[in-house]
């Protein structure tokens, strides 16, 4: 029997190294069968995930997945941190893995480092 559970496909331990001042779209891939669940984004503050209110979000569809997108227009240094999406389905809450945004403030770097440089130079990242 084919599974009809809601699934959220944010990859475990995923991260995105991005630059302040750029636009960025954070994708939450959602699989559902009949009715699209209500999906929200939150940002982790310690062990609590604080729901993001009043942010620009949108949906896109490809094949059998829908993508609930959180828009950063533009990315701010304060956007650094870990995010999670969650779906409200049949009165149950399904939570995704968290995904981390590492924001580099381009004002503090004379030129943009590469992704590989950023991975090996954590002092460039906001903690």
């Amino acid at each position: 029997k084919e599974s009809c559970d809601v699934q959220l496909y944010i990859k475990r331990q995923s991260y995105h190294s991005i630059f302040a001042g750029d636009p960025f779209k954070l994708e939450c891939p959602v699989k559902y069968c009949a009715h699209r669940p209500q999906v929200t984004w939150c940002k982790l503050n310690g062990t609590t995930c604080v729901k993001l209110e009043g942010r620009h979000t949108s949906w896109k569809q490809e094949k059998n997945l829908s993508f609930f997108i959180l828009h950063f227009e533009p990315v701010l240094p304060s956007d650094n941190g870990s995010y999670r999406c969650s779906a409200n389905f049949l009165s149950a809450i399904i939570e995704s893995h968290s995904t981390t945004l590492y924001v580099t403030d381009v004002k503090s770097a004379s030129e943009r480092p590469s992704k590989d440089e950023m991975a090996s130079r954590p002092w460039l990242l906001y903690s």
């Epitope: 960025f24 994708e27 699989k31 997945l65 992704k115 590989d116």
Partner: antibody, heavy 116, light 106 residues
């Protein structure tokens, strides 16, 4: 629909760097994840690594010290570099779209032989 | 990294047979497992995702089941075009593939 095409030299000398490019048509690499997989002659599939829509990467731990995957969004391409190759790196190399739950679109594969 | 062990490594079957291939993960992966079919000289083709969901365009004679560590791919009635090698694949942080099962004509 999305299509992928690998390109690059079919013959690489030992100790040199293998470089391959995957050109994506019918879709944008600014969404999803994009993987490289290889298959040595007569053997099974081995995941090499992926690059995300933001450019972040994740590599197979057994190959991590030798692998770099990068993307050029202006050309809608992503690339693989594998350094210090040996005969054990002889394989068919595939690029694929990682559609979160599995690799749903693959290139046709390109054979790379490591030999002097 | 999570290891996937497929069995059998090869099998012989006839057209119309019911074929079952198993895949065991070295640790629990929930339903994060896919199955592929590969024919000689061709790229793999996604058949099943989320352990039991049929990829679009794949015939309904293919089905998947399982969760946690033990998974099964079943072909309910083997067709001539189904003779191929089948791989399981877990898509955790470090994706891995099973060793493959070659389905041959008896």
């Amino acid at each position: 629909q999305v299509q992928l095409q690998e390109s690059g030299p079919g013959l690489v000398k030992p100790s040199e760097t293998l470089s391959l490019t995957c050109t994506v048509s019918g879709g944008s690499i600014s969404s999803y994840y994009w993987s490289w997989i290889r298959q040595p002659p007569g053997k099974g599939l081995e995941w090499i690594g992926y690059i995300s829509y933001s450019g972040s990467t994740n590599y197979n731990p057994s190959l991590k010290s030798r692998v770099t995957i990068s993307a050029d969004t202006s050309k809608n391409q992503f690339s693989l570099k594998l350094s210090s190759v040996t005969a054990a790196d002889t394989a068919v190399y595939y690029c694929a779209r990682d559609f979160y739950y599995g690799m749903d679109v693959w290139g046709q594969g390109t054979t790379v032989t490591v030999s002097s | 990294a999570i290891q996937l062990t497929q069995s059998p490594s090869s099998l012989s079957a006839s057209v119309g047979d019911r074929v079952t291939i198993t895949c065991r993960a070295s640790q629990g992966i929930s339903s994060a497992l896919a199955w592929y079919q590969q024919k000689p000289g061709k790229a793999p083709k996604l058949l099943i995702y989320d352990a039991s969901s049929l990829e679009s365009g794949v015939p309904s004679r293919f089905s998947g089941s399982g969760s946690g560590t033990d998974f099964t791919l079943t072909i309910s009635s083997l067709q001539p075009e189904d003779f191929a090698t089948y791989y399981c694949h877990q898509f955790d942080y470090y994706p891995t593939f099973g060793g493959g099962t070659k389905v041959e004509i008896k």
